[in-house]
Interface confidence: medium
């Protein structure tokens, strides 16, 4: 109970934190926190490489989809946004920025354009797109 | 610095929290936290009254839109969901569950159907709908 009181004072809360409630994060200021992952949607359109650089400059990466359960907030995302998925022409696989391979059944890949990068679209779809085309993008930071 | 160390241990963090990072909440477990407000999207379709009751049972209310800046994550919400906005036939105004009047220029109200309740749709649109029609809904809890 003491730690709850401490947290209340630390965060200028004057009420007890119910046991069913919890803090999320830590995340960069004004990012979305969900199941202890941090997300931010960026309105300005950049190509994939610029989007990746923007996320990296904020100590984050482009969106990585790793779990439909832990990331079910992504179901309801409107429009199309760069994520950290790229096509490796040599072996035909899709992999994330960290080098891990796209797990089966996580995303439905739809070939809308010519390209080696992927846009995230609602309901866990990946739309293939030319990496040099400007699009909005999603950065993600996984908390430790 | 001590409080950061304390928080690290409390949240099983083994790294320092950068000064630019912060915790969000508190929120009910597995809710979305953004700018210290808590949101949850519910998939099951209920009429407006059932949706309101569902939110209340979780110590929350149906979505209240009060600021485009503080709630800009709502821009990217796909589909249509009940929010806590109702039409008062006696004076023709739209008001929130807490009795406050809808501020001008916050929502674009679109008359899709005859009704006294409103669905939230992306980019700060409100669609008038019959309150007895089942729809998905958004609950919101404002932290103190």
């Amino acid at each position: 109970i003491w730690s709850a009181v401490f947290l209340n004072s630390l965060f200028n809360q004057e009420v007890q934190i119910p046991l069913t409630e919890s803090y999320c994060g830590p995340c960069p200021k004004n990012w979305i926190c969900y199941k202890n992952n941090c997300y931010q949607f960026f309105n300005e359109s950049k190509n994939w490489y610029e989007s990746q650089a923007s996320c990296m400059s904020q100590n984050a990466s482009l969106l990585k989809v790793y779990s439909k359960e832990d990331q079910d907030l992504l179901k309801l995302v409107k429009s199309y946004h760069w994520m950290g998925l790229v096509h490796i022409p040599t072996n035909g696989s899709w992999q994330w920025e960290d080098g891990s391979i796209l797990s089966p059944n996580l995303l439905t890949i739809i070939e809308m354009q010519k390209g080696d990068c992927a846009l995230y679209a609602s309901s866990f779809k990946g739309y293939i797109e030319n990496c040099s085309i400007p699009n909005t993008y999603i950065c993600m930071q996984r908390t430790v | 610095i001590w409080s950061a160390v304390f928080l690290n241990s409390l949240f099983n963090q083994e790294v320092q929290i950068p000064l630019t990072e912060s915790y969000c909440g508190p929120c009910p477990k597995n809710w979305i936290c953004y700018k210290n407000n808590c949101y949850q999207f519910f998939n099951e379709s209920k009429n407006w009254y059932e949706s309101q009751a569902s939110c209340m049972s979780q110590n929350a209310s149906l979505l209240k839109v009060y600021s485009k800046e503080d709630q800009d994550l709502l821009k990217l919400v796909k589909s249509y969901h009940w929010m806590g906005l109702v039409h008062i036939p006696t004076n023709g105004s739209w008001q929130w569950e807490d009795g406050s009047i809808l501020s001008p220029n916050l929502l674009t109200i679109i008359e899709m159907q005859k009704g006294d309740c409103a669905l939230y749709a992306s980019s700060f649109k409100g669609y008038i709908e019959n309150c007895s029609i089942p729809n998905t809904y958004i609950c919101m809890q404002r932290t103190v």
Partner: antibody
Framework: QVTLKESGPTLVKPTQTLTLTCTFS??????????VGWIRQPPGKALEWLAL???????RYSPSLESRLTITKDTSKNQVVLTMTNMDPVDTATYYC???????????????WGQGTMVTVSS | QSVLTQPPSVSVSPGQTASITCSGD??????VSWYQQKPGQSPVLVIY???KRPSGIPERFSGSNSGNTATLTISGTQTVDEADYYC??????????FGTGTKVTVL
């Protein structure tokens, strides 16, 4: 063999809501990658895409008409329904539904079209 | 919103080659489909993904796409090819976009 057929009113009054039904056969709208779209064509004019619904109930709308359109599906009945509110004489057109080609193959093409239904908006 | 521009009409003699162009910003970066529509009939897909022909479409129909222009070519044009032709592409802002349409007349 994939077939689609549109049905609905031939005459609608201005400000009314149009409801069109596309009944299809030869495929299932629960199969991954499948989609059904609506396209219209005013007399003597070009085709205009309106909306599309995917197998997983994900919906896409023409940005210029999004506020007026709703697309839904009934997988058990093999039907897709399009509603368009606040009809205006400029919405007079032939309305087609079409099958979107399968996953990762010609993702942007509509390979099979219905016969179309002519809708006139007039008072 | 994206705009795909086509010439309003193209005339060709039987047996000759008809070329229909479709212009749009960086169109070569996108996949283009082509549809044929005869009077009073529904559109029929004749080319998808720039160059591919659905089954049942004659070999005289071919497509190409680079730069800002996609082209539908009808080699050895026949009178049955007289129709309106529409190009179509997709992008993440306008989604599915159709061209302005070209009327092909076989003289």
């Amino acid at each position: 063999q994939v077939t689609l057929k549109e049905s609905g009113p031939t005459l609608v009054k201005p400000t009314q809501t149009l409801t069109l039904t596309c009944t299809f056969s030869g495929f299932s709208l629960s199969t991954s990658g499948v989609g059904v779209g609506w396209i219209r064509q005013p007399p003597g004019k070009a085709l205009e895409w309106l909306a599309l619904i995917y197998w997983d109930d994900d919906k896409r709308y023409s940005p210029s008409l999004e506020s007026r359109l709703t697309i839904t599906k009934d997988t058990s009945k093999n039907q897709v329904v399009l509603t368009m509110t606040n009809m205006d004489p400029v919405d007079t057109a032939t309305y087609y539904c079409a099958h979107r080609t399968g996953i990762a193959v010609a993702g942007i093409a509509f390979d099979i079209w219905g016969q179309g239904t002519m809708v006139t908006v007039s008072s | 919103q994206s705009v795909l521009t086509q010439p309003p009409s193209v005339s060709v003699s039987p047996g000759q080659t008809a070329s229909i162009t479709c212009s749009g910003d960086k169109l070569g970066d996108k996949y283009v489909s082509w549809y044929q529509q005869k009077p009073g009939q529904s559109p029929v897909l004749v080319i998808y993904q720039d160059t591919k022909r659905p089954s049942g479409i004659p070999e005289r129909f071919s497509g190409s796409n680079s730069g800002n222009t996609a082209t539908l070519t009808i080699s050895g044009t026949q009178t049955v090819d007289e129709a309106d032709y529409y190009c179509q592409a997709w992008d993440s802002s306008s989604l599915y976009v159709f061209g302005t349409g070209t009327k092909v007349t076989v003289l």
